[in-house]
């Protein structure tokens, strides 16, 4: 009797009615039920559709734009409980833009355990004022029932018997009104004696067992409930799951092997978003609670030492990151169980996006392969990568593999980054802009020195197109004004002076002195540095009178710190050996100057001898503002003010009393009274600030809800099947 049919997973039924038949044998939907976006359905399509076995939905019920559906009384005649374990934007029942729905008709709905109700923009929907929601859920004040036909007082809601002058349905008091309670013209709302609480009662008004929820077929018997208040086990409702059982999904008891099967099904499946269920404190749960991490071998949650790692298990043991989208799938991961292959050829704002998605990875159990990633300039987006275990290796026993990365110039800033490679070798070939010194530094830091064989690091195809600077350029002269910086640096000439094509000056605003050369750079044009090309100076034969190259940086912001460095631009020599020089990054601040004008000055007189002046600080202070200068001068009076007869009738009263100029302009506008010309008639009172605020909040809340609904509901079609949609799981 208790849950006679099957337990079905959450469903998203859209576009047409074909999938609705999957509900046929469901007693419980473990998850949510969304029925939506059916624009071609007609009332007759729903005539013979009924799912009498459906008793409970564990999450929420959402109906949105289903045309032709006029009532739910035949569709879900026995739906008794919506648990609201996971909610849709705080709601357990959402009826939104159901253009043909005339009544809810859920006449057996007795309990919404958690969450509230949102019924909005249903032009034909009546029988709302006849429902006492306080008998169904606790948080009635959070219900949002607006913009339905019911609002316009156009509904002639008639409860059963009313037409014959009888009152068949129970009446309850809401807001001081004693109203008959019904769902449709033929179905009363069932109201049990208050002593029964939410357990429900029989038709005779006898209370159900305290473990029941909503209804029962016999009083005081936990095996005769229609739904359970706590947990369901072996045909009865129980307060808690006794060992050997585990609590599952907040409503039923399952054994260990059930939980284990769920875990392994997910682990072995390729489906995104499934949960590798774990066991913790008598519960079989989708993931470990915060502060715990999963031990995959025994399904346990073990306490984390420090911040919890997020272990991401890669299907087939490896994952190729070839776009920002594929990087997003690893967002938040701290440990990669498998190997990563980076193959990024292009994209927008890559360095920042990759850091946002891969920047928390601390450990890779397999290997890391960077292959034909033309867009990468640096690997610094792996900001926290500290360990490559090399438990699985690339062919040839490599745990770090870099091949054909045309623009890769830096691995990490080795002065700030530690990386250990437990086992496996390094492989570097065809990375023309990556200097060998950078690779050798990695060997030292990572502990792989001595592991590599002769051809693992190609001497001729790494750094062969780079100016692998081995000399340090020093600035010899720095002068600042409020919008300019003049720089000079020591001259540099390669062995063949004709190889020097010039210098590149890099600069950018840097509020903090923590900038590195490759921050924010990729090879697709994203570069946080401004670059200036500077011709080499004229070469003098006298080494003592060499011209110091330099540049005047113009159009800078006053009182702003800039990070600056300069490097040489040299030709590629025949011997496949390049020279060059580069400066350290220096920080220079421009001078202060006059601030821009103060903003939004307001002046008000509050007496015959005072003027109050208020303003906002300038948008560009251009330095530390220490004080303001206020100038004023007396103006001649307007002659009209003297000539006006102030006793003339018909003059309007002043529209508002003086108030200090500290409110926003909007609130001042709202405070103005609008007096009407028609004498003797009362004017409408202005809205109070709190009313206006409430209206603004409500309008904003409505927009937020609609945005949320559209974001969740409108999803791209699956390319494979062409029907259905992704299964979003809001909470």
């Amino acid at each position: 009797h208790l849950y006679p049919g099957e337990v079905c997973p959450g469903m998203d039924i859209r576009n047409n009615l074909t999938r609705l038949h999957e509900l046929e044998n469901c007693s419980v939907i473990e998850g949510h039920l969304q029925i939506l976006l059916m624009f071609k359905t007609r009332p007759e399509d729903f005539r013979d559709l009924s799912f009498p076995k459906l008793i409970m939905i564990t999450d929420y019920l959402l109906l949105f734009r289903v045309y032709g559906l006029e009532s739910l009384k035949d569709l879900f005649p026995n739906l008794t409980v919506i648990r609201g374990s996971r909610l849709f934007f705080n709601y357990a029942l959402v009826i939104f833009e159901m253009v043909h729905l005339k009544e809810l008709g859920l006449y057996n709905l007795m309990n919404i355990t958690r969450g509230s109700v949102r019924i909005e923009k249903n032009n034909e929907l009546c029988y709302l004022a006849t429902i006492d929601w306080s008998r169904i859920l606790d948080s009635v004040e959070d219900n949002y029932i607006v913009l339905n036909k019911d609002d316009n007082e156009e509904c002639g809601d008639i409860c059963p018997g009313t037409a014959k002058g009888k009152t068949n349905c129970p009446a309850t008091v809401i807001n001081g009104q004693f109203v008959e309670r019904c769902w449709t013209h033929s179905h009363c709302q069932k109201v049990c004696p208050t002593i029964c609480k939410s357990h429900g009662c029989t038709a005779e008004g006898l209370c159900c067992h305290s473990e029941c929820l909503g209804n029962c077929s016999q009083p005081d018997d936990p095996t005769k409930c229609v739904a359970c208040r706590n947990f369901y086990l072996d045909g009865r409702c129980v307060e808690t799951c006794p060992p050997p059982y585990y609590h599952f999904q907040d409503w039923r008891c399952v054994n260990f092997s059930f939980c284990q099967d769920l875990h392994h099904k997910c682990k072995n499946s390729r489906r995104q978003g499934c949960h590798q269920y774990v066991i913790h404190n008598n519960k079989c749960i989708p993931e470990c609670p915060s502060g715990y991490t999963m031990n995959s071998s025994n399904l346990l949650c073990t306490p984390c030492l420090g911040p919890c790692p997020k272990v991401c298990h890669l299907l087939e043991g490896e994952k190729t990151i070839d776009s920002v989208t594929s990087a997003q799938e690893l967002r938040g991961c701290t440990v990669i169980n498998g190997s990563l292959i980076i193959n990024i050829r292009g994209g927008n704002n890559l360095a920042a996006e990759l850091e946002a998605n891969l920047g928390l990875i601390e450990e890779i159990s397999g290997y890391l392969k960077i292959r034909r990633s033309y867009a990468l300039v640096s690997l610094s987006f792996f900001r926290k990568l500290r360990l490559i275990r090399g438990e699985t290796l690339e062919i040839g026993n490599y745990s770090f593999y870099a091949l054909d990365n045309q623009n890769l110039r830096q691995l990490w800033d080795w002065s700030k980054h530690n990386l250990t490679i437990t086992q496996g070798k390094l492989f570097f070939h065809y990375n023309p802009k990556l200097c060998l010194s950078e690779i050798h530094k990695m060997e030292e830091v990572s502990g792989t020195k001595g592991r590599q064989e002769r051809n693992d690091i190609a001497l001729k195809t790494n750094g062969d197109q780079a100016s692998c600077e081995n000399e340090l350029l020093k600035f010899s002269y720095i002068r600042t004004s409020f919008d300019k910086i003049l720089l000079r640096w020591e001259p540099y000439w390669p062995p063949d002076f004709r190889d020097l094509l010039g210098f590149m000056l890099f600069y950018k605003e840097a509020p903090y002195q923590n900038v590195t050369e490759f921050d924010g750079q990729d090879a697709c044009g994203s570069n946080s540095w401004t670059v200036v090309d500077i011709d080499p100076p004229l070469r003098s034969n006298d080494p003592k009178s060499q011209n110091h190259p330099g540049w005047l940086m113009r159009g800078l912001k006053p009182w702003t710190q800039y990070a600056i460095f300069v490097k040489t631009l040299v030709t590629f020599s025949d011997e496949r050996r390049t020279y060059g020089a580069k400066s350290d990054i220096i920080y220079v601040q421009t001078d202060a100057t006059n601030p821009s004008v103060p903003l939004d000055p307001i002046s008000v007189s509050n007496s015959s001898s005072q003027i109050i002046l208020k303003w906002k600080p300038p948008s560009d202070p251009n330095g530390n503002i220490t004080h303001y200068l206020v100038f004023w001068e007396r103006q001649a009076e307007d002659s009209e003010l003297f000539e006006l007869d102030y006793c003339l009738k018909g003059l309007k009263l002043p529209s508002r009393t003086w108030s200090p100029p500290f409110e926003s302009e909007d609130s001042q506008k709202h405070n103005q009274s609008e007096y009407e010309d028609s004498a003797g008639e009362c004017c409408s009172c202005p809205k109070t600030d709190s009313q206006i605020l409430k209206e603004l909040e409500e309008s904003s809340f409505r927009k937020t809800f609609e945005d949320y609904l559209h974001n969740v509901v409108f999803v791209p079609r699956k390319t494979s099947s062409g029907t259905g949609a992704e299964d979003p799981r809001p909470s």
Epitope: D234, R236, P242, P243, H280, N282
Partner: antibody
Framework: EVQLLESGGGLVQPGGSLRLSCAAS????????MNWVRQAPGKGLEWVAL????????YYADSVKGRFTISRDNSKNTLYLQMNSLRAEDTALYYC?????????WGQGTLVTVSS | QSVLTQPPSASGTPGQRVTISCSGS????????VNWYQQLPGTAPKLLIY???KRPSGVPDRFSGSKSGTSASLAISGLRSEDEADYYC???????????FGGGTKLTVL
């Protein structure tokens, strides 16, 4: 008053049989899993057997499997433990205990002595 | 040999705080909640703590329980002479498919 009262203990020879009963009162007997737990003289507690609400599921400790049978009669609010092929090491004070997630209610115990 | 390991004895003076440990494995404490029982001399055991750290009504708040990983512990603060008893931890073991108890800890109030 909530209580469990065990009976049926006594002296029995090795290989013999004994049937213990546990009468429940003051609570809804059928709403609980029921257990037998024993304690050998001067020793710690040892779980013996468990039965579900309606008797459809039963669990036994390895040490008694195949020799002991747990059963219940919800109409009489009584739990039973049929003990066959008794051994000297089965000598103990036998408690019945009701269970939700823990053993909430305990009886005072009945002593079973297996000796020749 | 008990599946759950407890120290055989513990002691303290009145007013002191004592802690009794209970160590298990992944198949029991690791995935289950732990219960603690008090057995006063010559009486039946009584439930003291259930679900790791919850006290049944009537149990003073001087008794508290906790669990971490595959170990649990019972703490008794403000020790009194009437606390002198045997204390047992227990939980369900999924490998053995049955309840398991610790060997018990005899608490002496000096």
């Amino acid at each position: 008053e909530v209580q469990l009262l065990e009976s049926g203990g006594g002296l029995v020879q090795p290989g013999g049989s004994l049937r213990l009963s546990c009468a429940a009162s003051g609570f809804t007997f059928s709403d609980y899993y029921m257990n037998w737990v024993r304690q050998a003289p001067g020793k710690g507690l040892e779980w013996v057997a468990l039965i579900s609400y309606d008797g459809s599921n039963k669990y036994y400790a390895d040490s008694v499997k195949g020799r002991f049978t747990i059963s219940r009669d919800n109409s009489k609010n009584t739990l039973y433990l049929q003990m066959n092929s008794l051994r000297a090491e089965d000598t103990a004070l036998y408690y019945c205990a009701s269970q939700s997630t823990a053993f909430d209610i305990w009886g005072q115990g009945t002593l079973v002595t297996v000796s020749s | 040999q008990s599946v759950l390991t407890q120290p055989p004895s513990a002691s303290g003076t009145p007013g002191q705080r004592v802690t009794i440990s209970c160590s298990g494995s992944s198949s029991n404490i690791g995935r289950r909640t732990v219960n603690w029982y008090q057995q006063l001399p010559g009486t039946a055991p009584k439930l003291l703590i259930y679900d790791n750290n919850k006290r049944p009504s009537g149990v003073p708040d001087r008794f508290s329980g906790s669990k971490s990983g595959t170990s649990a512990s019972l703490a008794i603060s403000g020790l009194r002479s009437e606390d002198e008893a045997d204390y047992y931890c227990a939980t369900w073991d999924d490998s053995l498919n049955g309840w398991v108890f610790g060997g018990g800890t005899k608490l002496t109030v000096l």
